[in-house]
Amino acid sequence: FERTRSLQDPCSNCPAGTFCDNNRNQICSPCPPNSFSSAGGQRTCDICRQCKGVFRTRKECSSTSNAECDCTPGFHCLGAGCSMCEQDCKQGQELTKKGCKDCCFGTFNDQKRGICRPWTNCSLDGKSVLVNGTKERDVVCGPSPADLSPGASSVTPPAPAREPGHSPQ
């Protein structure tokens, strides 16, 4: 029955980018400007998303697909489909209600987004700390102390802090 009904339904022939216009005897009409339909057989077209303010257009709206937004420099996307933009912080910081704050000792953030995370506990895996952690960097774990030759130092000081380029997430 469903299959028979769909064969008889003129709207099922309307492709993506059009809608089935009830006001015009169910003729397939193109989506009006600033609207789209991503699937066939639709009775209305959806309004295109507009990327305004802190959002910027990553992909323009077309008759068959919605616009996609990302965030202006200094902000990063949050949520499905970049539903929100959140302020960037520097590496070694996290965003709090009071703005960007430095990571506490024993924590780090090597990105411009997200929270400060505890340094990895190397001993959890029977390893030792090879390179000390900083606000911007996790520790690097190395062999267990027993694996080191006598007199060998196990800890390397971290490389000088700098801010490597970071891909927007």
């Epitope: 990895t120 895996d125 996790d138």
Partner: antibody
Framework: QVQLVQSGAEVKKPGASVKVSCKAS????????INWVKQAPGQGLEWIGN????????NYNQKFKDKATITADKSTSTAYMELSSLRSEDTAVYYC????????????WGQGTTVTVSS | DIQMTQTTSSLSASLGDRVTISCRPS??????LNWYQQKPDGTVKLLIY???RLRSGVPSRFSGSGSGTDYSLTISNLEQEDIATYFC?????????FGGGTKLEIK
């Protein structure tokens, strides 16, 4: 024994989705990053993204942001990667990896899962 | 993104040879450079991390060196089981990137 065991090979049609799993055993799943890496036929390795299972925090390579979704299930110590809107260029071996104690290197690799996209 | 260049895509050497594979990142990666071995069956193994640290269980004939934008992996006494493709990888900056690989063959 510390290992990552991935799900079996998949053959999918263009436009379909696929979800690859990576089951961890022999270590505390929530304490290490799980990464996903792509290797197209005859090509090199590409980092797709990673997840910290403890809080499901993810990072993605911008190139794969609209292609891959990485999740983790702490109760089964399993990480997943779903690939959507498959195209022929998604045909590849996909590896899951675990870090060496910080996110900067990968000491443990799964055996790889071959995903073939063909009409 | 940081580009990782392995200039030699394939290399032929004799058993017992000393082989050096180079890797050049497009910017300073502060020693966050790792080397992996991929066998013909697809198995991947971490050999060296943080430029020169040998992973436990890896034979001492493997060594790594370098700094800044110039790194290398050396196999001091090539054995049959070393036939594989070797990849470098930077862990300095997201997205983490790999070199194109160097395939090592026996003459």
């Amino acid at each position: 024994q510390v290992q990552l065991v991935q799900s079996g090979a998949e053959v999918k049609k263009p436009g379909a989705s696929v979800k690859v799993s990576c089951k961890a055993s022999g270590y505390t799943f929530t304490s290490y990053w799980i990464n996903w890496v792509k290797q197209a036929p005859g090509q090199g390795l590409e980092w797709i993204g990673n997840i910290y299972p403890s809080d499901s925090y993810t990072n993605y390579n911008q190139k794969f942001k609209d292609k891959a979704t990485i999740t983790a299930d702490k109760s089964t110590s399993t990480a997943y990667m779903e690939l959507s809107s498959l195209r022929s260029e998604d045909t590849a071996v996909y590896y899951c990896t675990r870090d060496y104690g910080s996110a900067y290197s990968y000491s443990l690799w799964g055996q790889g899962t071959t995903v073939t996209v063909s009409s | 993104d940081i580009q990782m260049t392995q200039t030699t895509s394939s290399l032929s050497a004799s058993l017992g040879d000393r082989v050096t594979i180079s890797c050049r990142p497009s910017q300073d990666i502060s020693n966050y450079l790792n080397w992996y071995q991929q066998k013909p069956d697809g198995t991947v193994k971490l050999l060296i991390y943080y430029t020169s640290r040998l992973r436990s269980g890896v034979p001492s004939r493997f060594s790594g060196s370098g700094s800044g934008t110039d790194y290398s992996l050396t196999i001091s006494n090539l054995e049959q089981e070393d036939i594989a493709t070797y990849f470098c990888q930077q862990g300095d900056t997201l997205p983490y990137t790999f070199g194109g690989g160097t395939k090592l063959e026996i003459k």
